[in-house]
Interface confidence: low
Amino acid sequence: MAFSGSQAPYLSPAVPFSGTIQGGLQDGLQITVNGTVLSSSGTRFAVNFQTGFSGNDIAFHFNPRFEDGGYVVCNTRQNGSWGPEERKTHMPFQKGMPFDLCFLVQSSDFKVMVNGILFVQYFHRVPFHRVDTISVNGSVQLSYISFQNPRTVPVQPAFSTVPFSQPVCFPPRPRGRRQKPPGVWPANPAPITQTVIHTVQSAPGQMFSTPAIPPMMYPHPAYPMPFITTILGGLYPSKSILLSGTVLPSAQRFHINLCSGNHIAFHLNPRFDENAVVRNTQIDNSWGSEERSLPRKMPFVRGQSFSVWILCEAHCLKVAVDGQHLFEYYHRLRNLPTINRLEVGGDIQLTHVQT
């Protein structure tokens, strides 16, 4: 996607969290909050779109409560006073489970999707352009908060004729480059620091009418699988790759490959049939020795959403799943810039890829 002007994601923010939304809310802005509901500490969490850090002016308070069978409260706070609550008596979150929560800002409302499914619309009670801060509090651990700016330019032809079965994320924008704002990313990390956020475009129809979004969209957006994309500049120390998606209910396996030419520098292969997360490298069609050790139980669950964050360091890749560090994989192919292709395949549905 070409997110000129989009801000860099907040990675691993501790809760309670408050962070600036650079440029404030705009029509078409999509904000993704990815994390895990804590299993037993507290019964609520909240995502607030607010003016400043005081919490007195909250344009949109999104507040899941694991009480009375579970429900979600939406509300607005003006000058310290809450308005009437809007309650949704359905709880799309589960304690102890990861989630992918997408907020799409539109001229009349916020549209909220949870794990790829449209959950609620919340009509604006105050002008949304006053909002300049997002805050998250309560019994939740965050993996990342990312921003997708509506000001986009088509960069390449869209995919087409790809079937899918259910909505996955908001109709996205075209793919391309995104410049990071100054002062957010390291001043001297590596030669190339562009981030590309990939979503799918093309196919007739679109789920929401948003003037900022080009008209050619999937009616139910999904990443075509297998999904293959270039990693601009390849890997280098500090390079991050973020992926989120949902494991199919009958999944056997899926894989995330970081490739260099015909070689697979890093093969991440969760196997539900073996209850294992296999890591390996393939050079000239020959696999090396597998690494399978995990610090805890298998983090991927059939039918559940997940997020993966791969951080490239000088000597290894660090991999976190759903906000928890999972393992390190020491580089076997050491020419990092040549590792410039991401391939994802298998029994998952992708909702977000950021390289």
Partner: antibody
Amino acid sequence: EVQLVESGGGLVQPGGSLRLSCAASGFTFSYYWIHWVRQAPGKGLEWVADIYPSSGYTYYADSVKGRFTISADTSKNTAYLQMNSLRAEDTAVYYCARGWYAAYGMDYWGQGTLVTVSS
Amino acid sequence: DIQMTQSPSSLSASVGDRVTITCRASQSVSSAVAWYQQKPGKAPKLLIYSASSLYSGVPSRFSGSRSGTDFTLTISSLQPEDFATYYCQQYALRPLTFGQGTKVEIK
């Protein structure tokens, strides 16, 4: 090789100020939490503050909130702890440490710098 | 704030002994607990993260486990270099909090 080197400690009078530095090398500074942890003489460890340099987000212990400010300069790979309105109970060895992501612990520590608040 | 209650505060043991130190969190912290070893005049060293993951370079005689909000550090066979003070720490929620420490002394 990962290294964290603290400096700036010393003797200061109550109510005074001091600025500690933590120079980092051997890793990608912006993508690690940088923590300040202190240890009063003969006592246990107490977390003071931390910062995620990539986003500049900061957290503080209640005992120092409003008096201490943590910051980071990614161009210099250095974190700072500005300590104002110092009290006798702030006397301690101050360590900086790094932590990756949200669930990893503090895997590298500096050697510590002693701050003594006394009249 | 989450309290980490560590016990015992001190213990005496001999080389070769099996040593167990426990830490109880005042509320759920998932597996976001680390264990550190500190020797006099030195900075702490990470031993265990994510409750049970052995940090690289740490001898395998050290292990960690979790049962609900109870966390345990075990040294299977105490060595002379293991005499030190050990701390648990939770990093599930700010403020980060440490246990009060357990000093392992020579019997």
